[in-house]
């Protein structure tokens, strides 16, 4: 293994070297959602395609029951886009009861669940007021950032209203993560 | 430095180690677009600056004729932002004929062309209805995600209407990819 | 043309190997902003949380006085999201004097400051016209891309109007960078 020593003396290496192709990675794509129960005060979670088309999981990054399972501690870049679409001829039509003067909105949250911590942690949130004049509207919310995760953490994507999610194409709504 | 060899036997390395600085990478920036032919049913492709200002290509990642050329198989993070701007005093003014009740829209697609598949593959799409009341409007669409690409694949960015793309500044409209 | 076949990727290693866990990285999160002086013709810079909650800096990447300090030359992925919110019942209410027919807007700029260069460099800009009919509006602008940075460079996030930035939650407004 001598030839693979990284030896230049100025180089401080504090962690073992590892092959990039061996890092946990996943890109999940949208599927048609089935209405599911969700906790009060918590937005419903999307479920995902993990192996067909553009979707994949690799190197011990697994997907199960709406969650990406983190197999190894480290810093991960996590991203998601959700495309929403709705039909409304004026703002007031999709206004929820009891919300006078508060605009309608669409929200995406990437959430971390840790067994050792009772409350889910919101890592990323994209939220947008919607007050479209046209009869049909559609728009994406994109999120992405780096987080330090622990082995065993679980990631999910929550949305304010599952019925507004565009599930028609794998390139419009997606969710991914990779170890840096 | 012998002890710093990456040899610990518990470490499964399934791929050859390689220096990060040697990985294919590119960040391309907007230039003024010239109208070009494009396939029926396919949005026109943008062309890009690849060496001036903030733009660069490195480590065998090349740009030619609207395409980023993938020199090595692997997992890439691909991203683009396109800033659109238009002028309209009401929604109906930029409405295309024959599209009653369908909102005007702006769309960005990152497309992969591969020799092993006759159809270009849409990797990422950002699409947004536009129904602006103001006389001038502008807004960005951002996309980014990870994909498994093959040596020889080509990437391009397609837009719904080239004439609406803001080509004035390199920080407003851009396209990039890097091997993870 | 034999030479134009792409060479096996595992062979040419032009840079020393280094452990991924040792790379400079930071994720900063929003704090309540205090009004600060800023240069004429330059948007004000946000300041950030760098160690509490989801925020961190590591491996010689430091945060000081609104700036992320780049400790090592290389290619970095840089990202930010700023969530804006405002109150207006019609477009004209937040219109600045002397800007007839020009839409109100929100803008985020990620800026690089280099000691050896007199002018800051705008790396990324997200700018959006705002003409909301509803009485309260809110929306994010997300940016992210890869840039070649030099040791000693400083990064900051500038916004068009600090008073419109949503500083209430660390997942809504953030700024990060990591060495690739």
């Amino acid at each position: 293994l001598k030839g693979q020593e990284f030896a230049p003396s100025h180089q401080q290496v504090y962690a073992p070297l590892r092959a990039d192709g061996d890092k946990p990675r996943a890109h999940l794509t949208v599927v048609r959602q089935t209405p599911t129960q969700h906790f009060k005060n918590q937005f419903p979670a999307l479920h995902w395609e993990h192996e067909l088309g553009l979707a994949f999981t690799k190197n011990r990054m697994n997907y199960t029951n709406k969650f990406l399972l983190i197999p190894e501690s480290g810093d991960y870049f996590i991203y998601s886009q959700v495309t929403f679409r709705g039909m409304t001829s004026e703002c007031s039509e999709i206004r929820q009861a009891g919300r006078p003067n508060k605009p309608d909105s669409i929200t995406v949250v990437i959430t971390k669940v840790t067994d050792s911590y009772p409350e889910p942690t919101q890592l990323l949130m994209g939220t947008k007021s919607v007050c479209e004049v046209g009869s049909n509207w559609f728009q994406p919310i994109y999120l992405g950032a780096m987080f330090s995760l622990q082995e065993g953490d679980k990631l999910m994507v929550n949305v304010s209203d599952i019925s507004l999610v565009d599930y028609t194409k794998e390139d419009k709504t997606f969710f991914g993560a990779f170890l840096l | 430095l012998k002890g710093q060899e990456f040899a610990p036997s518990h470490q499964q390395v399934y791929a050859p180690l390689r220096a990060d600085g040697d990985k294919p990478r590119a960040h391309l920036t907007v230039v003024r677009q010239t109208p070009t032919q494009h396939f029926k049913n396919q949005f026109p492709a943008l062309h890009w600056e690849h060496e001036l200002g903030l733009a660069f290509t490195k480590n065998r990642m090349n740009y030619t004729n609207k395409f980023l050329l993938i020199p090595e198989s692997g997992d890439y993070f691909i991203y683009s932002q396109v800033t659109f701007r238009g002028m309209t005093s009401e929604c109906s003014e930029i409405r295309q004929a024959g599209r009653p009740n369908k909102p005007d829209s702006i769309t960005v697609v990152i497309t992969k062309v591969t020799d092993s598949y006759p159809e270009p593959t849409q990797l990422l799409m950002g699409t947004k209805s536009v129904c602006e009341v103001g006389s001038n409007w502008f807004q960005p669409i951002y996309l980014g995600a990870m994909f498994s690409l093959q040596e020889g694949d080509k990437l391009m960015v397609n837009v719904s209407d080239i004439s609406l793309v803001d080509y004035t500044k390199e920080d407003k409209t851009f396209f990039g990819a890097f091997l993870l | 043309l034999k030479g134009q076949e792409f060479a096996p990727s595992h062979q040419q290693v032009y840079a020393p190997l280094r452990a991924d866990g040792d790379k400079p990285r930071a994720h900063l999160t929003v704090v309540r902003q205090t009004p600060t002086q800023h240069f004429k013709n330059q948007f004000p810079a946000l300041h950030w949380e760098h160690e509490l909650g989801l925020a961190f800096t590591k491996n010689r990447m430091n945060y000081t006085n609104k700036f992320l300090l780049i400790p090592e030359s290389g290619d970095y992925f840089i990202y930010s999201q700023v969530t804006f919110r405002g109150m207006t019942s019609e477009c004209s209410e937040i219109r600045q004097a002397g800007r007839p027919n020009k839409p109100d807007s929100i803008t985020v700029v990620i800026t690089k400051v280099t000691d050896s260069y007199p002018e800051p460099t705008q790396l990324l800009m997200g700018t959006k016209s705002v003409c909301e009919v509803g009485s309260n509006w809110f929306q994010p602008i997300y940016l992210g891309a890869m840039f070649s940075l030099q040791e000693g460079d400083k990064l900051m996030v500038n916004v068009s109007d600090i008073s419109l930035v949503d500083y209430t939650k660390e997942d809504k407004t953030f700024f990060g960078a990591f060495l690739l």
Epitope: - | F39, A45, N65, K66, D115, P118 | -
Partner: antibody, heavy 116, light 106 residues
Framework: QVQLQESGPGLVRPSQTLSLTCTVS????????IHWVRQRPGRGLEWMGR????????KYNPSLKSRVTITRDTSKNQVSLRLSSVTAADTAVYYC?????????WGQGSLVTVSS | DIQMTQSPSSLSASVGDRVTITCRAS?????MYWYQQKPGKAPKDLIY???NLASGVPSRFSGSGSGTDFTFTISSLQPEDIATYYC?????????FGQGTKVEIK
């Protein structure tokens, strides 16, 4: 409309080099990939290789790699095939074909006979 | 190399019959492609990426399968379908074709 047209000599002497040109029209050559496929008399189809005209990047059938060269001239909308050291076993109809567009297209084929 | 084994090598069926051709790859592939070649003509795309109908191809043609086993079907054979049909995989190098199935009318 999309067209691919093979051209070249119909007769090549043994041990010489076979040269064919594929001229395309109706699409941007650099947007796609061009393949060469041959069909020997009474036999099936054999993929010879392909070029990405945008980059010049080529892939060849390993069984032919030592003898085949594919190049492109985007200014003329042409892709060329050269097969060296031919024998009678190289007698075939040679097709150029496109992939990477909305549909694949094939040329009509060019019969090349190797004979002295 | 990925070898493609196509069967049968020839078949004879009546107009209106359902015709099935199979193709087996020596290694798993993501997609299979099917072509039709009439005597003296260039091959024509029929099915791409296993199950997608190429532009202008009648709906009586279909494809299915995954991994190593793929199937091409003509749901109701027509006189104009007399031709040789080839499968092809595009993933390994070389891009290999099956040896062809010649379809005739009884």
């Amino acid at each position: 409309q999309v067209q691919l047209q093979e051209s070249g000599p119909g007769l090549v002497r043994p041990s010489q080099t076979l040269s064919l040109t594929c001229t395309v029209s109706g699409f941007d050559l650099q947007d796609t990939y061009i393949h060469w496929v041959r069909q020997r008399p009474g036999r099936g189809l054999e993929w010879m290789g392909r070029i990405d005209p945008a980059s010049g990047h080529v892939k060849y059938n390993p069984s032919l790699k030592s003898r085949v060269t594919i190049t492109r001239d985007t200014s003329k909308n042409q892709v060329s095939l050269r097969l060296s050291s031919v024998t009678a076993a190289d007698t075939a109809v040679y097709y150029c074909a496109r992939s990477g567009g909305m549909t694949d297209y094939w040329g009509q084929g060019s019969l090349v006979t190797v004979s002295s | 190399d990925i070898q493609m084994t196509q069967s049968p090598s020839s078949l004879s069926a009546s107009v209106g019959d359902r015709v099935t051709i199979t193709c087996r790859a020596s290694f798993s592939v993501d997609y299979m492609y099917w072509y039709q070649q009439k005597p003296g003509k260039a091959p024509k795309d029929l099915i791409y990426a296993t199950s997608n109908l190429a532009s202008g191809v009648p709906s009586r043609f279909s494809g299915s399968g995954s991994g190593t086993d793929f199937t091409f079907t003509i749901s109701s054979l027509q006189p104009e379908d007399i031709a040789t049909y080839y499968c092809q995989q595009w993933e390994g190098n070389p891009r290999s074709f099956g040896q062809g199935t010649k379809v005739e009318i009884k």
